[in-house]
């Protein structure tokens, strides 16, 4: 969302969030590094380009032309300057001057060490509980943002962790019409359409690089969890990882895990719907988990096929139209999972990326909860690392994402909501170990293992 | 001026915990992550681990792991190291240091004079 | 968790000589590293951080070098006040451990 420093009355009115980086002569004297050549305060660019007729409310939603309902003025960084005032690297640099390359490596859960796991797990837990240091979240829309009194900014600080699930709330929110009036559903900024694997890379790159910082280790990395094992159990939902399930309620997590005193956040949808607000930073409930517990839906009881990713693979297309989930061999449709792993368009189907949630059964199996589960993480990681392989075999080949005429937030060149700076769908459609600084270690089906690179 | 003063040597016994502060000044702690580093007598440098401050997160090296605890009071701009269930092995010299995470700087770049604990029954 | 190895353990030099001390990492650290200098009976004393540059207030006789896994820390014409335990640091990956020391005697 945006920096805590913008999240005041004068930023939102000037519609200006240009954050000083070393203001050692006062206020305002070092907006985005510019005093140290790393930044300057520039003009928004926004997509403008028309968008598929699914949306059909333009002008109702804050989310629109994202940014510039709520700022038109940002940060523009130099070099390998990045960050919401120039005081970071683009993924993939690291130091003073941001000029030395460093690659970190995302691995298979499964494969760390006890003490690997410790750590990642004592990780999540700790963002979890640590307040983030840069963001703040709105808790109104945009018309209510100043309060009831028109004097008072509608922000929230809230958690490392719970940033990363508000994001993907906000991502893929109804759009409010109006008191009285039912909220439109059939919007979705970040699945759906060809933005999704872009979207959830930026996703996981953000939370990896805040946990970074929080942990003071610029190589920690997120592990994945390779969903494609074609059985009926979690082999990640272990005490010692993901936490096992509860002899007391088989939808709960164990009580010998950390996670099973996790509480959500972004779980009443009813109240923000009907009354137009925004998810907050309030905890509820606990997580609920009950993978392949679905007796009513057999075909969610078993994981993908090892040889669904290969299948998968072997798409050439990134996407097509009409650029949504019924698109026919698109490889983002097909990894996504509203695809047979072939790439023929089912709408009975539900396979990879999709059939995990949904073996899942539980807060994960639900679009605006999911990442509440931190599995959440490890299917994505596993999701982008498919995404990254396509990337390699294809020579990373953009021309099938559209330009214009996708679902609404899903053009190429739109900034994908809610993240902060401005970050455009092309900005990752990279290969990973080039151009993002972090690989995987993965062995696809009938390859030898390797490092991405 | 940035300072980092420990408190003074300690004999304990063994089995026994003691807690070791470390107050800083010239800098606000809540600015900084404070790291602790011990030296067994005659040896090299082990680190044991840093904390936050401002938000009481830590981390340790695992051999520390549950021995080790450190906590802070900002309002005193101060820091502890708490050492339970300790043995001879534990007798060294533990130092307090910050690390200045300005575009991440790889160093610790202040130091407390150590602290001696002497662990003997 | 990544080691370091530091060489040589000590060594012997007299004044105005270079000498080089090495830490190779178990891993690329990607410059991740400072030099300490300890004098017996003192606390270290910060000389380079991230691999090659000196700390405020450090005499330009010494100098930090390296990439990936290799780091050196060269001293040039060596003083007495030399004297002491040097120390290299990662900070690459947690744990952040330290080499093992090199003790330098001048003659």
């Known amino acids: 969302q945006f920096p805590r420093e913008c999240a005041n009355i004068e930023a939102l009115r000037r519609g200006v969030c240009c954050p000083d980086l070393l203001p050692s002569s006062g206020p305002g004297t070092d907006p985005c590094g510019s005093s140290s050549g790393r930044g300057r305060c520039v003009a928004v660019i926004a997509d403008s380009r028309p968008h598929s007729r699914h949306y059909p409310h333009d002008g109702k939603d804050d989310r629109e032309a994202w940014p510039l309902r709520f700022f038109n003025r940002t940060c523009q960084c130099n070099d390998n300057f990045s960050g919401h005032n120039c005081g970071t690297c683009r993924p993939g640099w690291r130091g003073a001057a941001c000029n030395q390359k460093i690659l970190t490596v995302r691995r298979n859960l499964l494969d760390l060490s006890p003490e690997e796991k410790s750590h990642f797990v004592r990780a999540l837990d700790m963002a979890k509980r640590t307040t983030h240091p840069q963001f703040v979240i709105a808790t109104r829309r945009l018309e209510d943002i100043l309060g009831p009194d028109g004097n008072t900014p509608q922000f929230e600080n809230i958690s490392v962790y719970n940033y990363f699930v508000w994001t993907h709330y906000y991502s893929v929110k109804k759009t409010f019409l109006g008191t009285g009036q039912e909220s439109f559903g059939d919007v979705d900024f970040s699945h759906e359409g060809p933005a999704f694997l872009t979207w959830h890379r930026y996703h996981l790159l953000q939370l990896e690089r805040d946990m970074q910082e929080m942990l003071q280790e610029p190589s920690f990395s997120l592990p994945y969890w390779n969903f494609a094992t074609g059985k009926n159990v979690c082999d990640v939902c272990t005490d010692d990882l993901m936490g096992s399930r509860s002899n007391f309620d088989s939808t709960l997590i164990s009580p010998n895990s950390v996670f099973s005193q996790w509480r959500v956040v972004c779980e009443s949808l009813e109240e923000y719907d009907t009354l137009g607000t925004l998810c907050n930073s309030t905890e509820g409930g606990p997580i609920r988990r009950n993978p392949a517990g679905n007796v009513g839906r057999p075909a969610v009881q078993r994981l993908p096929e090892p040889q669904d990713v290969t299948q998968c693979l072997e798409v050439r297309v990134f996407d097509t139209p009409p650029f949504y989930s019924n698109s026919t061999d698109s490889f983002r449709n097909t990894v996504e999972g509203y695809s047979a792993p072939t790439g023929k368009y089912d709408p009975a189907v539900r396979s990879l990326h999709n059939l995990a949630h949904l073996f899942l059964n539980g807060t994960g199996g639900q679009t605006h909860l999911s990442p509440n589960d931190p599995i959440f993480v490890l299917l994505h990681t596993f999701t982008d690392a498919v995404f990254d392989e396509w990337l390699r075999r294809y020579n990373a080949d953009i021309s099938t994402f559209p330009l214009e005429n996708a679902p609404i937030g899903h053009n190429r060149q739109y900034n994908m909501v809610p993240f902060w700076p401005p970050v455009t769908n092309t900005e990752m459609f990279v290969t990973a170990p080039d151009n993002l600084g972090y690989a995987y270690e993965v062995q696809w089906p009938g390859q030898e293992f390797t490092v991405s690179e | 001026e940035v300072q980092l003063q420990q408190s003074g040597a300690e004999l304990v016994r063994p089995g026994a915990l003691v807690k070791l502060s470390c107050k800083t000044s010239g800098f606000n702690i809540k600015d900084y992550f404070l790291h602790w580093v011990r030296q067994r007598p005659d040896q090299g440098l082990e680190w044991i681990g840093w904390i936050n401050p401002d938000n009481g997160n830590t981390v340790y090296d695992p051999k520390f792991q549950g021995t080790a605890s450190l906590t802070a009071d900002t309002s005193s701009n101060t820091v502890y190291l708490q050492l339970s269930g300790l043995t001879s092995e534990d007798t060294a010299v533990y130092f307090c240091?910050?690390?200045?995470?300005?575009?991440?700087?790889?160093?610790?770049?202040?130091w407390g004079q150590g602290a001696s604990v002497i662990v003997s029954s | 968790a990544i080691q370091m190895s530091q060489s040589p353990a000590s060594l012997s030099a007299s004044v105005g000589e270079t000498v080089t001390i090495t830490c190779r990492a178990s891993g690329n650290i990607y410059n991740y590293l400072a030099w300490y200098q300890q004098k017996q009976g003192k606390s270290p004393h910060l000389l380079v951080y991230?691999?090659?540059t000196l700390a405020d207030g450090v005499p330009s006789r010494f100098s930090g070098s390296g990439s990936g896994t290799q780091y050196s820390l060269k001293i040039s014409s060596l003083q007495t006040e030399d004297s002491g335990n040097y120390y290299c640091q990662h900070f690459w990956s947690l744990p952040f451990t330290f080499g093992s020391g090199t003790k330098l005697e001048i003659k």
């Open positions: 991230d691999a090659k």
């Open positions: 240091t910050r690390r200045d995470y300005t575009y991440e700087k790889a160093a610790l770049d202040y």
